[in-house]
């Protein structure tokens, strides 16, 4: 059961795994989610009634029953891990914490003009986990404008104290904003340097993902299952060095080495979806259940929140109605305690963490008036929204922004009485693919902006909550929402897509069309539409000479812009005068202006859900963006 709300003045009793320090309850919840065993947590906020040495403690907890007794305690904030939830979460934390000193090993100090510059330095330094910046109002002359880069064994502060006129924050490496990526995998090569941890993994790719999410792993060496020393087979050595790169490497048969991908614009999702045949994973047994197949066993593991990995033993002929045994397992670190080969088992990992899709990493793969046909998988966030009344037809475009959410235009729902008549098809290139038996997503709820009246006056935005969740694949996955911190970005690579008309009097296209269209300034756009008010909540795109534009049927679809190799949903196709007319740009809903609205609507407002202001002990945040791209916390 997914419980997103935080419980104020509540403490969970018992079940302690470990205590870390976090600047907020929200971040404590993220730390809990990424911890292999944490299901619940109790955070202690700053409070006069509480011993200052306990301020900002985040106690990570586990429970066989998935719950613990609740006790009333002032300043305590408790909650549950997002492991139980189906929405995306991310380790990315762009919040800046005012008047908090996050303690760690200060390994670098330098002068910086601003906290943002300090955070950028931290993000671009391989060792940095978090930073503290003394503002120019800081009492100590020598400390003013000093940026202290810090790291710890756990990646979280060793202590957090109140300190006036400083600000602290975390590295944004997990936001896919660093520029230090090495994606190469080196066969038959072993790296030297310092081992920070040793885990067992079935292959080098799992080893790399574990390295990526380990706070101090910069590179790794994996010993395959045919490595000469039996006791070292399947060993994944997580490594670091002072320089941040391997100081030396040795050619070694049956070893594979590589780097953490944390500093990449495409951080892997924190899960391992492959099956490992003729492989048994050992660990603490959680349960043994009958299952028809290894796929069914993986589902059972995924649905059992404490299960981390499994081994499936296929049925012996005619035994147990053809069902095999599914061993659900766990360990202290989320990895098997031993990996055995040649016993006939099929093993794998829980998929519960696959939804922890990392910071927006939607990439381009190696309808539209004046457009050209798209290829399959080119616009995996694009959906076609159909109405079944009076007959089934394409109604509008839309964009996947989360695994239960489609963002589209409000004007699409004129005359739509009920979500029951709507169908969302994803992963579609040609409308002709849609047959009676084609799978679709039903719509549970249509959320139209309450200030929407008509497309031309703005607020032309709507959310569709799907009845079931979208499993992300290469052909259907989300697009990033633009970051509020990127308001000043000048997008130069923008595309409008859809199955809409290719000219004003036309019909819906079969193949998804695409057209590259330049953005137009709002001043320029206003000149072209003297009879309308072009607000900052609108964004315009089009060629002065016309010729390429969105048109009828493209409405609600995306204006997608690529920035730093990441696609952002910059606009929602809204309105325009004719189609592709000279000096009549298309007008789109300016998505960045609705990020807060999207966050508010996609987060279920449940009882006892507490805001930052309610938390006496939560720090005042200055947030570069409260919505971390398409993740709904």
């Amino acid at each position: 059961e997914c419980v997103t709300q935080l419980l104020k003045d509540t403490c969970f009793e018992g079940g302690d795994i470990t205590t870390v320090f976090t600047p907020s309850a929200k971040y404590c919840q993220v730390v809990c989610t990424y911890h292999p065993r944490c299901l619940l947590f109790t955070f202690t906020a700053e409070s006069p009634s509480e011993d200052p040495t306990r301020w900002f403690t985040c106690v990570l907890k586990d429970s066989v029953t998935e719950t613990l007794p609740r006790v009333n305690r002032t300043a305590a904030i408790s909650g549950y891990s997002f492991k139980q939830c189906s929405h995306q979460i991310s380790a990315c934390n762009k919040d800046i914490y005012v008047d908090l000193d996050m303690k760690g090993i200060n390994y670098n100090s330098s002068v910086a003009k601003s906290a943002q510059e300090c955070q950028e330095r931290c993000t671009d330094d391989v060792h940095c986990h978090f930073f503290t910046y003394a503002t120019r109002q800081f009492p100590s002359l020598e400390h003013r404008n000093i940026c202290l880069l810090k790291h710890t064994q756990t990646g979280t502060p060793t202590r957090i104290t109140k300190l006036d006129k400083v600000v602290s924050g975390f590295s944004l490496k997990s936001c896919a904003l660093s520029n230090l990526c090495h994606m190469n995998i080196f066969q038959h090569l072993a790296f030297s340097d310092v081992d920070v941890a040793r885990v067992l993994t079935p292959d080098a790719f799992v080893c790399r993902t574990i390295c990526t999410y380990h706070p101090n792993c910069l590179f790794f060496t994996f010993y395959t299952n045919v490595w000469k020393i039996e006791s070292q087979r399947n060993v994944c050595l997580l490594k670091t060095s002072e320089s941040g790169t391997p100081s030396s490497s040795t050619p070694q048969e049956n070893t594979i080495s590589g780097y953490s991908l944390l500093t990449c614009h495409s951080i892997p999702v924190f899960c391992h979806s492959s099956f490992y045949h003729d492989t048994d994973f050992l660990g603490e047994e959680l349960d043994i259940v009958a299952a028809k197949s290894h796929e069914a066993c993986q589902k059972l593991c995924t649905n059992a929140v404490r299960c981390q990995f499994f081994t499936y033993t296929p049925a012996q002929a005619s035994c147990n109605e053809g069902k095999g045994k599914c061993y659900l397992k766990l360990s202290s670190n989320g990895s098997p305690t031993k990996i055995l080969h040649g016993r006939g088992g099929i093993s794998g990992y829980t998929l519960r963490l696959c939804k922890m899709d990392n910071e927006c990493t939607t990439k381009i793969k190696p309808r539209i008036v004046g457009g050209t046909a798209s290829v399959r998988g080119e616009w995996p966030w694009q959906v076609t929204l159909h109405t079944t009344s009076p007959t089934q037809r394409h109604l509008c475009g839309g964009s996947i922004i989360g695994n239960q959410w489609i963002l589209t235009a409000a004007h699409c729902f004129y005359g739509v009485e009920s979500p029951k008549i709507l169908r969302v098809y994803s992963g579609i290139l040609n409308q002709s693919e849609i047959k009676e038996d084609t799978s679709f997503f039903g719509v549970q709820e249509i959320i139209i902006h309450d200030q929407y009246k008509m497309a031309e006056s703005g607020y032309d935005i709507a959310l569709l909550k799907l009845e079931t969740t979208v499993n992300y694949t290469d052909s259907q996955r989300p697009i990033c929402l633009p970051s509020k911190g990127d308001r000043n970005v000048i997008y130069t690579d923008c595309w409008v897509t859809g199955w809409g008309y290719r000219k004003l009097r036309d019909k819906i296209q079969n193949t998804l069309q695409k057209a590259k269209i330049p953005l137009v300034t709002n001043e320029e756009c206003q000149k072209r539409y003297r009879g309308h008010k072009i607000t900052h909540k609108m964004i315009c795109a089009g060629y002065r000479e016309g010729g390429k534009d969105a048109c009828k049927g493209d409405s609600g679809g995306p204006l997608s812009c690529k920035h730093n190799e990441v696609w952002h949903l910059v606009g929602i196709t809204s309105w325009g005068e004719g189609c592709a007319q000279r000096e009549r740009p298309g007008v789109y809903t300016n998505v960045v202006e609705y990020v807060d609205w999207i966050l508010e609507k996609t987060q279920a407002v449940e009882q006892k859900l507490i805001s930052e202001e309610d938390l006496g002990g939560e720090q005042k945040l200055i947030s570069e963006e409260d919505l971390h791209h398409h993740h709904h916390h």
Partner: antibody, heavy 121, light 108 residues
Framework: QVQLVESGGGVVQPGRSLRLSCAAS????????MHWVRQAPGKGLEWVAI?????????YYADSVKGRFTISRDNSRDMLYLQMNSLRAEDTAVYYC?????????????WGQGTLVTVSS | DIQMTQSPSSLSASVGDRVTITCRAS??????LNWYQQKPGKAPKLLIY???SLQSGVPSRFSGSGSGTDFTLTISSLQPEDFATYYC??????????FGQGTRLEIK
Amino acid sequence: QVQLVESGGGVVQPGRSLRLSCAASGFTFSSYNMHWVRQAPGKGLEWVAIFLSYDGSNKYYADSVKGRFTISRDNSRDMLYLQMNSLRAEDTAVYYCAKSEILVVPTLDYWGQGTLVTVSS
Amino acid sequence: DIQMTQSPSSLSASVGDRVTITCRASQSISSYLNWYQQKPGKAPKLLIYAASSLQSGVPSRFSGSGSGTDFTLTISSLQPEDFATYYCQQSYSTPPITFGQGTRLEIK
């Protein structure tokens, strides 16, 4: 290794001037804040002045020397100076130059051996 | 300016003794406190920074604690070379940097 060597001390009459020098080696001089600290005979330590590394205009002084002493540095020669004018008897002290390092908080992590200034008629 | 007050001004102790020197700031200085040791005719030497962190090369018998306004320097087992004068110094609200008046530790 870090070394700081002061020179220029001596006996001087009240009202006269003296210039102290501090030669630095073993570290990137231009990157560090530098201080002068003094100690009157048989007394405690008293901070005198600081020259910040990252801003040429950032020189600060103790109230007791403000307007009379001037701190300066020559990064090309790894030298720190203290120009002392209008000297008074109460300026008699051993003068130390010290390197500052931010070890979580600002500290005076290396000191010279000191140079004695005696102001006497 | 922040005033720093050390106590005692002087104390006598024997080799092997545990010794504690305290330092009080006239207002909160967080953990912006350093301790120095000075032997006669020598320059001061940094012992402890940020109230409790041991400077590299300093023996582990030296330790510091405290936060806010009250701080202590502890020598767990006095050695002959520890007889010296000890100064606390705040670097929280500067300029000026201010020192305590010193504590002279003598052999009993």
